[in-house]
Amino acid sequence: QGWQAFKNDATEIIPELGEYPEPPPELENNKTMNRAENGGRPPHHPFETKDVSEYSCRELHFTRYVTDGPCRSAKPVTELVCSGQCGPARLLPNAIGRGKWWRPSGPDFRCIPDRYRAQRVQLLCPGGEAPRARKVRLVASCKCKRLTRFHNQSELKDFGTEAARPQKGRKPRPRARSAKANQAELENAY
């Protein structure tokens, strides 16, 4: 049982700590090729590559406040959202918004979270309550994950919503008695 996702006041979905997003299931070995779907051409396409490292995907940065109950982070956090389709790195700038023109058949590559980081967030609460903290688990980088369409299947499951959800956590409040901790916090230890 993991830290559950909850919808906070800012309507962001923030999973709690134990619910680390899992990468999508590996579908590479489930490859089926439909000749009709390929238009009678061989399955290979000049732009396809077997090396996932040659593919690239976009990392979109966005900033949001973290909320928990009636509390809100003193500062916004910046995190990544992994954006949609992957393309060969050399073609990606031209491929944005162009869909699947560069590979009409064969493997599909999706942009999903790769690494995460935890960030301490100081929460400001109403009514003079003790400052509180949580740790937010944020996407630190994205990667291309190779998937394969099933036979006659043109649409792939979108893993974005489950894979890209940041992980929530809280950070300690600064304490007058702990100058070292305060300094680390002010310098954003993460």
Epitope: L17, G18, A130, K135, P172
Partner: antibody, heavy 118, light 107 residues
Framework: QVQLVQSGAEVKKPGASVKVSCKVS????????QHWVRQAPGKGLEWMGW????????EYASKFQGRVTMTEDTSTDTAYMELSSLRSEDTAVYYC???????????WGQGTTVTVSS | DIQMTQSPSSLSASVGDRVTITCKAS??????VAWYQQKPGKAPKLLIY???TRWTGVPSRFSGSGSGTDFTLTISSLQPEDFATYYC?????????FGGGTKVEIK
């Protein structure tokens, strides 16, 4: 699967110290806050404090200030709570708990019984 | 320190009953209250936080309400596995403190 496994029962003499360990698995300990809560026999729960393994920040209940030390080894994902100058009223089950906040206790260890007796 | 006073200290109920446990804070704690369930010989389990938010996997028959100084944990239809001791906890001000517990027993 989040799991916290604590060290075994301890019997101590008054004035001695005890160090209880709590091995965390299922996520990195540095991404959490570690809490310690105790429960005297037949009594309620008493919060002792929390620590942040990432930077070593701590918050102790004033009642335990000066007697308790909470530390972690992030390389082994293990938290420790040391209580010194033990007295008979420190006889209790000591629980470690973890969570992503400084204020609620999401997952708990199974508890470690510490008996202080001369 | 903020005192959390639970009532009743114990109650007897039958499976299917609606059970209400109250917790009164000695000062305003806004909604900074959590509820835990503890069975004999076991560690507590988080049920509710922020007075009314259910924790992961907690059945919908458990609900929390209240703000300020008065809080309630309600079990809408008591199940056999719900016989346990329930604790409230405030996290409005240090030190975090718990209520004395309410033991729910089989009638």
């Amino acid at each position: 699967q989040v799991q916290l496994v604590q060290s075994g029962a301890e019997v101590k003499k008054p004035g001695a110290s005890v160090k209880v360990s709590c091995k965390v698995s299922g996520f990195p300990i540095k991404d959490t806050f570690q809490h310690w809560v105790r429960q005297a026999p037949g009594k309620g729960l008493e919060w002792m404090g929390w620590s942040d393994p990432e930077i070593g920040d701590t918050e102790y209940a004033s009642k335990f200030q000066g007697r308790v030390t909470m530390t972690e080894d992030t390389s082994t994902d293990t938290a420790y709570m040391e209580l010194s100058s033990l007295r008979s009223e420190d006889t209790a089950v000591y629980y470690c708990a973890t969570g992503d906040t400084t204020y609620k206790f999401d997952f708990w260890g199974q508890g470690t019984t510490v008996t202080v007796s001369s | 320190d903020i005192q959390m006073t639970q009532s009743p200290s114990s109650l007897s109920a039958s499976v299917g009953d609606r059970v209400t446990i109250t917790c009164k804070a000695s000062q305003d704690v806004h909604t900074a209250v959590a509820w835990y369930q503890q069975k004999p010989g076991k560690a507590p389990k988080l049920l509710i936080y922020w007075a009314s938010t259910r924790w992961t996997g907690v059945p919908s028959r458990f609900s929390g309400s209240g703000s300020g100084t008065d809080f309630t944990l309600t079990i809408s239809s008591l199940q056999p596995e719900d016989f346990a001791t329930y604790y409230c906890q405030q996290y409005s001000d240090y030190p975090w403190t718990f209520g004395g517990g309410t033991k729910v027993e089989i009638k």
